[in-house]
Amino acid sequence: YTSTAQPCPYPMAPPNGHVSPVQAKYILKDSFSIFCETGYELLQGHLPLKSFTAVCQKDGSWDRPMPACSIVDCGPPDDLPSGRVEYITGPGVTTYKAVIQYSCEETFYTMKVNDGKYVCEADGFWTSSKGEKSLPVCEPVCGLSARTTGGRIYGGQKAKPGDFPWQVLILGGTTAAGALLYDNWVLTAAHAVYEQKHDASALDIRMGTLKRLSPHYTQAWSEAVFIHEGYTHDAGFDNDIALIKLNNKVVINSNITPICLPRKEAESFMRTDDIGTASGWGLTQRGFLARNLMYVDIPIVDHQKCTAAYEKPPYPRGSVTANMLCAGLESGGKDSCRGDSGGALVFLDSETERWFVGGIVSWGSMNCGEAGQYGVYTKVINYIPWIENIISDF
């Protein structure tokens, strides 16, 4: 008695697919595979397959059913923080070769990484013209201010809305200031946040307000405090710089905008007698913390002149280092003061028409605005590698 195995039904390729190998008939243990055209993928229902092979069984049936070759669907594109996405090919079209365009919210954000145009590729991922599968980035535009002209505020004037949108009020023990970098970092002075370095959550960070005591402000909380490793508390103010990482990104608007970091060419806008602007809620001439955000325009002072001013007692020799810059009037009267610490001394980059942080309010004479003495600021340009490393690492 002999029997021959029944041949299996001839495999009909699914639409947009083909069978291989093609045979006249398929008998016991013969197999075939299905390959889909570019832009189509093997699916068993909703489940994707990289490959498909069926084997002919002795009862003349295939051991598995035919899959489908379905057009690749990249799915709805991810939302872009501070941006939006537009369907170019057609409303809601997300299949192979469909095109979408990401864009950032105008005025306050600019697109980084690529041009925002993405295509649904055969691998099922939205892909930029540069081949990137990750989202573009909407980075806050820095250095925008309502002012068009170019810590410690003494002899200053009241700021108006949008003048210093990077200004941050730091409460937590004492009143201090800082400047917003990007949308989740604050640049400040090390001495202003030294006590909170191990208790970042104790810092109450406020922005988007002019009035120090106003209930209307944007609240931010600190995730971590990074103090420059070269800073020694109670032993001078060298390396008086710190970064605060916020636990959430803040929404950028005309009242909350980051300050720019100085470009390599920034020194050309920070020469002796160039005007910088310091802002804060520190002590005024009346001896009280300012209720309203104040600012003062002050010239950069020759470094040797400043060093000499702080060589005589009660200041120890070498108080002014190469990591500092000084600003103020020889005649006095205009200065930053206690409570302004950590705030930014900003300059207008006339090439980019953006404001950048040149200094951080650090220290000065006991009597603010004293003739022959100057406000001393951390020289930010010396710390760009340190700032960039911290921000990229964390």
């Epitope: 229902g45 909703h46 489940l47 397959l49 990289k50 598995r64 799915g75």
Partner: antibody, heavy 116, light 107 residues
């Protein structure tokens, strides 16, 4: 033989994130198929949560889309579930699985309680 | 979402009987249905996929049939180890959805 094993904390506080790991042995998660997360509530109701495919593409249950993320570490042959803003309703036994295609394999499940 | 309805929560049977468990999809799912067996404290075990294809190692007393919206799992010669919960799953479209289950118990 293909084996899957779930791991992660058994207790999560409301509003926090639930994070689970599925370690796969006996088959590379990049070779083929879709690798799913499924959960079973106390009354035995099963819910498919989503998958990550061999290519790294994901598909999520729309009811969870705003809270769920499935990722993988191909070097460790692991895939992960993160479910944000959990409530007591997320208390369940969580399974990782390779469903249907090329054989059907499930982990033994890990019980997660959401409670303060 | 596609609703998979298993109208009978419980079914009583005896060893040696033939029993049919049914599952109805709220819309056409082709043949993209799996049948699972689950015992207390265990993960589900797949029996049938693509409506009628038996997974390897599954006894041939288990058979599946149906397409479109109506599906049946038949156990032709019930054994004591078959007393468990039986669930259907559609994997045709996102989201994959399970039936509520039918518990097979002794008369």
């Amino acid at each position: 033989d293909v084996q899957l094993q779930e791991s992660g904390p058994g207790l999560v506080k409301p509003s926090q994130s639930l994070s689970l790991t599925c370690t796969v042995t006996g088959y590379s998660i990049t070779s083929d198929y879709a690798w799913s997360w499924i959960r079973q509530f106390l009354r035995n109701k099963l819910e498919w949560m989503g998958y990550i495919s061999y290519s790294g593409r994901t598909s999520y249950n729309p009811s969870l889309k705003s809270r769920i993320s499935i990722t993988r570490d191909t070097s460790k042959n692991q895939f992960f579930l993160q479910l944000n803003s959990v409530t007591t309703e997320d208390t369940a036994t969580y399974f990782c699985a390779r469903l249907i295609t090329g054989g059907d394999y499930w982990g033994q499940g890990t019980s997660v309680t959401v409670s303060s | 979402d596609i609703v998979m309805t298993q109208s009978q929560k419980f079914m009583s049977t005896s060893v040696g009987d033939r029993v049919s468990v049914t599952c109805k999809a709220s819309q056409n799912v082709g043949i993209n249905v799996v049948w699972y067996q689950q015992k207390p404290g265990q993960s589900p075990k797949a029996l049938i996929y693509s409506a009628s294809y038996r997974f390897s190692g599954v006894p041939d007393r288990f058979t599946g049939s149906g397409s479109g919206t109506d599906f049946t799992l038949t156990i032709s010669n019930v054994q004591s180890e078959d007393l468990a919960e039986y669930l259907c799953l559609q994997y045709d479209i996102n989201p994959l959805t399970f039936g509520a289950g039918t518990k097979l118990e002794l008369k």
